[in-house]
């Protein structure tokens, strides 16, 4: 008799999830000499241990602590780039500006990027059929709790000027409900961080509006100022040109405002 299985509203675990996590870990530790000491089998065991045999709506940050410990990594605290709803451009930027880091440039972020996973209460099986959706099912699911945990730690580590890339094409350029708005903003440490610098990325070719005056940006400024951190904002009118000038600031096309 087939065992009854909970049907969740979200997509199931990414196929070949264990193999993908293990392969990514091996690749990352080969590329990053400072992480060569990491035992990827232990990393996978700790990752698995965070959600296997547990109810996928009852996951806690505590469940991920063994994984957090194994994945401990020091990135330059003044070279952190946060992002919200504009992941691809943020990653393109750090691929060029190699000394800056998004969360997905760290081991733990790299392992989990774009993946979904969950288990089932009291069985050692991974659920490839469905996983809880944050809105429709529950917020304390394995994926959401993972990203909340690593995002909090990443923000806590930041210092000096922290940069955040925001999507100027969205109706809410700053969204209080995003990971940036609900976790990272509130975990920047005022005793270490002097300024949060927002880069608002324009989507339209001819969009010359000052999106730093957007009401949601003003809301972000207010939240940050109340936390005793300064705030600054810059419009990036031409993201393609911005990336080009990061690659080569001496390029002749970089002699005007970006």
């Amino acid at each position: 008799v087939p065992r009854w299985r909970q049907q969740w509203s979200g997509p199931g675990t990414t196929k070949r999830f264990p193999e993908t996590v293990l392969a990514r870990c091996v690749k990352y530790t080969e590329i990053h000499p400072e992480m060569r000491h990491v035992d990827c089998q232990s990393v996978w065991d700790a990752f698995k241990g965070a959600f296997i045999s547990k109810h996928p709506c009852n996951i806690t940050e505590e469940d991920y602590q063994p994984l957090m410990k194994l994945g401990t990594q020091t990135v330059p605290c003044n070279k952190i780039l946060l992002w919200s709803r504009i992941k691809d451009l943020a990653h393109q930027f750090t691929q060029v500006q190699r000394d800056m880091f998004t969360l997905e440039d760290t081991l733990l972020g790299y392992l989990a990027d774009d993946l979904t996973w969950c288990g089932e209460f009291n069985t050692s099986k991974i659920n490839y059929q469905s996983c809880p959706d944050w809105r429709k099912d529950c917020s304390n699911n394995p994926v959401s709790v993972f990203w909340k945990t690593v995002s909090r730690r990443f923000a806590e580590a930041a210092c000096d000027v922290v940069h955040v890339m925001l999507n100027g094409s969205r109706s809410k350029i700053f969204d209080k409900n995003s990971t940036f708005g609900s976790v990272e903003v509130h975990n920047l440490q005022p005793e270490k961080v002097q300024t949060l610098e927002a880069w608002v990325i324009h989507g339209g070719r001819e969009d010359s509006r000052d999106l730093c005056q957007d009401p949601t940006i003003k809301e972000l400024e207010s939240i940050i100022s109340k936390r005793n951190i300064q705030f600054s904002c810059k419009n990036i009118y031409r993201p393609d040109k911005f990336l080009q000038c990061v690659k080569n600031p001496e390029d002749s096309s970089c002699t005007s405002e970006i």
Partner: nanobody
């Protein structure tokens, strides 16, 4: 290339004020982070303050509340307003530039001025 020229350094009494200027030419000034460093007699060059292309400011702990960095993109100039000066602020003050992002490490700045001497003494 970015050319930088500092000015404004002079002899000043303890407790006094001074405003240093750094005029830039050669590239689009507004795309560059600008910083002030200083080198006292027999000391290493040390970070004082920086301002990014987006106007984010960054200060060394020893100048917080006394010094203010600002920029005027229309004039291609960065300023360092120095108040409540102390004898230990005596140094050659250098202006530096790098693409976009404000950081503390001198090695990360590509362009440097020749420096301007500030002496705090009674």
């Amino acid at each position: 290339q970015v050319q930088l020229q500092e000015s404004g350094g002079r002899l000043v009494q303890p407790g006094g004020s001074l405003r240093l200027s750094c005029a830039a030419s050669g590239r689009t000034f507004s795309n560059y982070a600008m910083a002030w460093f200083r080198q006292g007699p027999g000391k290493e060059r040390e970070f004082v303050a920086a301002i990014s292309a987006a106007d984010s400011t960054l200060y060394a702990d020893f100048v917080k509340g006394r010094f203010t960095i600002s920029r005027d993109n229309a004039k291609n100039t960065v300023y360092l307003q120095m108040n409540s000066l102390k004898p230990e602020d005596t140094a050659v003050y250098y202006c530096a530039a790098r693409w976009w992002i404000a950081v503390r490490a001198p090695a990360e700045y590509n362009y440097w001025g020749q420096g301007t001497q500030v002496t705090v003494s009674s």
